[in-house]
């Protein structure tokens, strides 16, 4: 069923007559050109056909020039990530423009007014790009529209009004009511600017997605699944925010996509890799690692500009802090016997030991179930750089740590109470790294001890051949 | 009310070309993309490409190799579309359309026949 | 291009008849699809936009459905007015496709 938002009103309602009164005198969409990282600093405000402030100001016709466009906005205030995301680029990007779009007089209403003010927004900001392109040596590639939440579909919508093509938009976490399933042209889509990537980080399948769900962009990034972000749990909430509610989890998560891409900014020696998936299940199961073929990509203001036929959706793990780098390896195990398994599938868990560092105990997660007589894909990330890997210590949990399953085995036991011992069979464990590209082999330490069992441990070893490199290309990635 | 007055039926020999109007009324013209679909007689819908008055930006369906040309006045919001090297399977109902939701209201539509 | 396959290309049903037409993707495009309905010799007239919302003025019996690469039109008791041809449509990305059409004529 749909969302609990109805349309928007009749196209013919839509003539954006002003709202202003008479006595008002503040127009409803403000350019405010940032020409200090302090945000007490009140810097310059543009007007079309004004040229005064662009001298005054030092705007600077050659350089990059990014327009940051906020959302909704329940305060009617600016929120601190905006003036994060001012600072971060200023820091990054010393000689470039930084403009904040200021349309909170439209943008504290209703949710559904906000909406409808979206397309009036992106107008705006469309006539203000048309005025610059009349300057001399502004040139529409060097902008970089940045629209968090409704502010990605504004930027969409300037994109889409502006005489020619702006040279990227990044949606950070793009809103979902009355914009999931919309026409290509009510919402940010591909065709808005050269480069349109996507930061999604608030989705739900169910209930109200505060954020987009479907592709919106060139490359749509989906970091934890797009969905659950580490440290947004109501219990990190709780222990950060003095009065945490459900409506700090829901910005937790939904503003985390502005940190990402802050993150990008200032800690581009940590960039952070998204690979190509069709879906978050396949994803978490370790079978979408590669960087073949435009597979990989950076996410945030490092991203390289894919433009593909089709939507590129991305995945990738986070830490729950800055920085958000996590590192990705792919775990093949080929399980080639099993003895008396019952219902319940086993929990494993893996240690790492590299040349650099060891990392915890990481659990395997079983997305579907565990297959013998082959391959079974996981996937497990450190928060860690563990250098060269030398061996993998892997751990069948013994005692069950749910009810449901300890249930489980007591019906099983119930069932066949002389089951023998449940044994699983493993000779070698394949890991391919996601950050390196780089792929290696682990054979059991001794080659006559294959079998596991819960409560019990095997280690492997690096096989003889050592790292082996299959003309995969490492995402690596040139900073601009 | 929103409406689209479209131009009046045309009968064009093969390998001329044909452009038919499409006035538009009762919204912002400039802001709203307004797609050209045909239909040739009991056939489905065809999508033939859309303009942005305001920008005069244009998406067209490749099928048409450059024969369809889409082009706009805003001093008196109307958009045209040009369609060259005319063919007797190009003979169909064009009509002109305007986007917000899906294609919200279209026109009347022009009868477009192509015979020798 | 995206294909929009709809099914069945025409229906013979009675006033009072629920009527189900579904229309298949050949690719992912999520909810984005709107449903027209065309009377002979006049336009076509948006029922249906985002897979699931009814557009201004629409009777309450046409609803939509769907998600992903399929999706349905149903008319849950059909009215002498109802008798027309049916187009769905993509409106996910450029070029915009139109299903074959279902045509729904009198039993």
């Known amino acids: 069923s749909p969302v609990p938002f109805g349309p928007e009103g009749r196209l013919e309602d839509k003539l954006h007559k002003p709202k202003a009164t008479q006595t008002e005198v503040k127009p409803s969409v403000r350019f405010n050109l940032r020409t200090s990282k302090d945000p007490e600093h009140e810097g310059c405000y543009l007007s079309v056909g004004h040229s005064q402030p662009l001298e005054d100001c030092s705007f600077n016709m050659t350089a990059k020039t990014f327009f940051i466009i906020h959302g909704w906005t329940m305060s009617g205030i600016f929120e601190n990530w905006l003036h994060k995301l001012v600072s971060a680029l200023h820091t990054r990007e010393k000689d470039a423009n930084v403009v904040v779009v200021d349309w909170l007089p439209l943008a504290h209403q209703l949710y559904t007014d906000a909406v409808n003010n979206t397309r009036v927004v992106g107008h705006s900001i469309a006539r203000m790009l048309d005025w610059l392109q009349e300057k001399d040596d502004f040139s529409l590639g060097n902008v970089h529209l940045i629209g968090y939440s409704l502010g990605a579909h504004v930027a969409g919508y300037a994109g889409n009004f502006v005489k020619g093509t702006v040279g990227r938009i990044t949606g950070l976490d793009p809103a979902g009511p009355m914009f999931e399933g919309a026409d290509i042209h009510k919402r940010l889509s591909p065709d808005d600017a050269d480069f349109v990537d996507v930061l999604h980080t608030y989705t739900r399948s169910f209930g109200l997605s505060i954020g987009i769900q479907m592709p919106v962009g060139h490359i749509d990034i989906y970091p934890n699944g797009g969905d659950f972000q580490p440290g947004c749990g109501l219990n990190d909430v709780l222990g950060s925010i003095a009065y945490g509610t459900i409506t700090e989890v829901v910005k937790c998560e939904h503003e985390r996509a502005v940190h990402l891409f802050v993150d990008s900014l200032v800690n581009q020696d940590k960039p952070s890799f998204a690979f190509q998936c069709t879906d978050s299940n396949r994803f978490k199961k370790g079978i979408c690692l590669s960087c073949r073929k435009n597979r990989c990509n950076s996410i945030g203001y490092n991203a390289k500009k894919m433009r593909n036929k089709r939507n590129s959706k991305m995945y990738l793990k986070t830490r729950a802090g800055m920085p958000f780098r996590v590192y990705h390896y792919q775990m093949k195990i080929h399980v080639f016997s099993y003895k008396n398994m019952g219902e319940i599938e086993p929990t494993f868990y893996v240690t790492l030991y590299g040349t650099n560092a060891d990392s915890q105990t990481l659990p395997l997660e079983i997305v579907e179930r565990i297959e013998q007589n082959a391959t079974n894909t996981f996937l497990v990330y450190t928060e860690e750089d563990l250098g060269d890997l030398l061996k993998i210590q892997l751990t069948w949990e013994g005692a069950s740590q749910s009810w449901y399953n300890l249930w489980k085995e007591f019906r099983s036991y119930l069932s066949q109470p002389r089951n023998p011992g449940r044994e699983l069979n493993i000779r070698r464990i394949r890991v391919k790294s996601g950050e390196t590209q780089r792929k290696l082999t682990f054979c059991t330490e001794d080659p006559e001890n294959t079998s596991i069992s819960p409560g019990r441990e095997l280690w492997f070893r690096k096989c003889r051949d050592g790292w082996r490199m299959k003309n995969e290309t490492s995402p690596t990635v040139e900073l601009p | 009310q929103v409406q689209l007055v479209q131009s009046g039926a045309e009968v064009k020999k093969p390998g001329a070309s044909v452009k038919v109007s499409c006035k538009a009324s009762g919204y912002t013209f400039t802001t709203y993309w307004i797609a050209w679909v045909r239909q040739a007689p009991g056939q489905g819908l065809e999508w033939m490409g859309e303009i942005l008055p305001g920008s005069a930006k244009t998406k067209y369906n490749k099928k048409f190799k450059g024969r369809v040309t889409m082009t706009r006045d805003t001093s008196t919001s109307t958009v045209y579309m040009e369609l060259s090297s005319l063919r007797s399977e190009d003979t169909a109902v064009y009509y002109c359309?305007?986007?917000?939701?899906?294609?919200?209201?279209w026109g009347q539509g022009t009868t477009v026949t192509v015979s020798s | 291009d995206i294909q929009m396959t709809q099914s069945p290309s025409s229906l013979s049903a009675s006033v009072g008849d629920r009527v189900t037409i579904t229309c298949k993707a050949s690719q992912d495009v999520y909810t984005a699809v709107a449903w027209y309905q065309q009377k002979p010799g006049k336009s076509p007239k948006l029922l249906i936009y985002s897979a699931s919302y009814r557009f201004t003025g629409v009777p309450s019996r046409f609803s939509g459905s769907g998600s992903g690469t399929d999706f349905t039109l149903t008319i849950s008791s059909l009215q002498p007015e109802d008798f027309a041809t049916y187009y769905c449509q993509q409106h996910y990305s450029i070029p915009r496709t139109f299903g074959g059409g279902t045509k729904v004529e009198i039993k």
């Open positions: 359309a305007v986007y917000d939701y899906g294609a919200d209201y």
